[in-house]
């Protein structure tokens, strides 16, 4: 006999970095039939919706209308069908941002490499905070953090042209309070013979930093889902 | 701006019954999930009762389930809270709070958590005697 449902999938709109004071969705999809949806917030319940009639919806949403530190953490969901309780969604980093400074990014050697070079990427925040993160532009950018006093370094080793784009880094001040965006570092890589076209991206995934640089010019962009960044198992 | 007052509160004893009321003014008060939560002589604030702004959804804590109801009235911007069967440990002081920012809240969801609201009373205190 069945013990649980299958878990529901949990993500943010319009993305899981919300700059401060800016509004964020956080949506829950689990099955139709379900009575009620809970949000789970550092492991407390946060919220509660018994969607109606809940036999025609299977999503939910959380809007949150105001982004601050205490909101930042990590949420999950669960879902309930009849007395039969799912397994709890994978966990959603709610990150703010726009928080005290902004830091300074550069690269050596430089902008412009030869494919095969070896790049490194700094990230440089004279205030207190002892992590950085650098993200690429992209629908499949992923977030690599770096660690040091007022700097952290980001080796890519020998580069290719999949390194080609715009990258951005931030300090943390926590793991979900970072620091305003630095400004754009284009990398432009050349000399592949094999490859000189940009590498394709991953289509099944929205553009990313185009999402969050929505949210900081515009506020709330509706009905652009967004998956969460830690992958759905 | 907003402003919550609360009142209703009282000295009973206990298995007597008690009605807290919420007037909200500054706001969209149809438009927005209320809470009420509470914080005995000692202890730390804590959720007591939820409901959504269309009244479907409510929510309680094990605590007071089967004793407590909220409610509200959307026309006279006011939300309730009727206690029945009060307790010794009934004893506290009461807020209502409301939650921030605008329109686009479910009609079906509630907040269970004090970080979720922006705006609260100055709270009503409840004491019950035996």
């Known amino acids: 006999q069945q013990q649980t449902l299958p878990k529901p999938f949990i993500w943010a709109e319009p993305h899981f970095m919300v700059p401060k004071e800016k509004q964020v969705t956080i949506c829950c999809q689990g099955n139709y039939g379900a009575v009620e949806y809970q949000l789970h917030f550092e492991g407390s319940l946060f919220a509660v919706d018994r969607p109606k009639p809940p036999e025609r919806i299977n999503k939910v949403k959380f809007y949150i209308p105001d982004m601050n530190s205490r909101m930042a953490g990590q949420y999950s969901c669960i879902y309930r069908v009849g007395e039969l309780w799912s397994e709890p969604s994978n966990l959603l980093d709610l990150v703010v941002t726009e928080m005290y400074d902004t830091p300074t990014l550069s690269v050596h050697p430089g902008p412009e490499v030869i494919s095969g070079e070896k790049v490194t990427f700094y990230c440089r925040l004279d205030t207190a905070t002892s992590m950085f993160l650098l993200l690429k532009e992209g629908r499949s950018s992923h977030v690599q953090r770096g660690y040091g006093k007022v700097q952290a370094e980001f080796p890519l080793g020998p580069v290719t042209t999949a390194h080609r784009g715009t990258y951005r880094c931030f300090g943390s001040y926590n793991n979900h309070a970072w620091s305003f965006p630095s400004e754009p570092v284009k990398l432009l890589v050349t000399g592949d013979i094999e490859n000189t076209s940009l590498a394709p991206e991953d289509p099944t995934f929205p553009d990313t930093w185009g999402t969050y640089l929505l949210t900081t010019e515009t506020g709330l962009q509706k009905d652009h889902a967004l998956w969460d960044h830690t992958a759905q198992n | 701006d907003v402003q919550l007052v609360e009142s209703g509160g009282g000295l009973v004893q206990a298995g007597d019954s008690l009605r807290l009321s919420c007037a909200v003014s500054g706001r969209t008060f149809s438009r927005l999930p209320m809470g009420w939560f509470r914080q005995g002589p000692g202890k730390d604030r804590e959720f007591v009762a939820a409901i959504s702004w269309s009244s479907s959804t409510t929510y309680y804590a094990d605590s007071v389930k089967g004793r407590f109801f909220i409610s509200r009235d959307n026309a006279k911007n006011t939300a309730y809270l009727q206690m029945n069967n009060l307790r010794l440990e009934d004893t506290a002081v009461y807020y209502c709070?409301?939650?921030?920012?605008?329109?686009?809240?479910?009609?079906?969801?509630?907040?269970?958590?004090?970080?979720?609201?922006?705006?609260w009373g100055q709270g009503t205190l409840v004491t019950v005697s035996s």
């Open positions: 709070a409301a939650v921030g920012g605008s329109l686009d809240y479910s009609a079906t969801v509630v907040y269970t958590a004090a970080r979720a609201y922006a705006d």
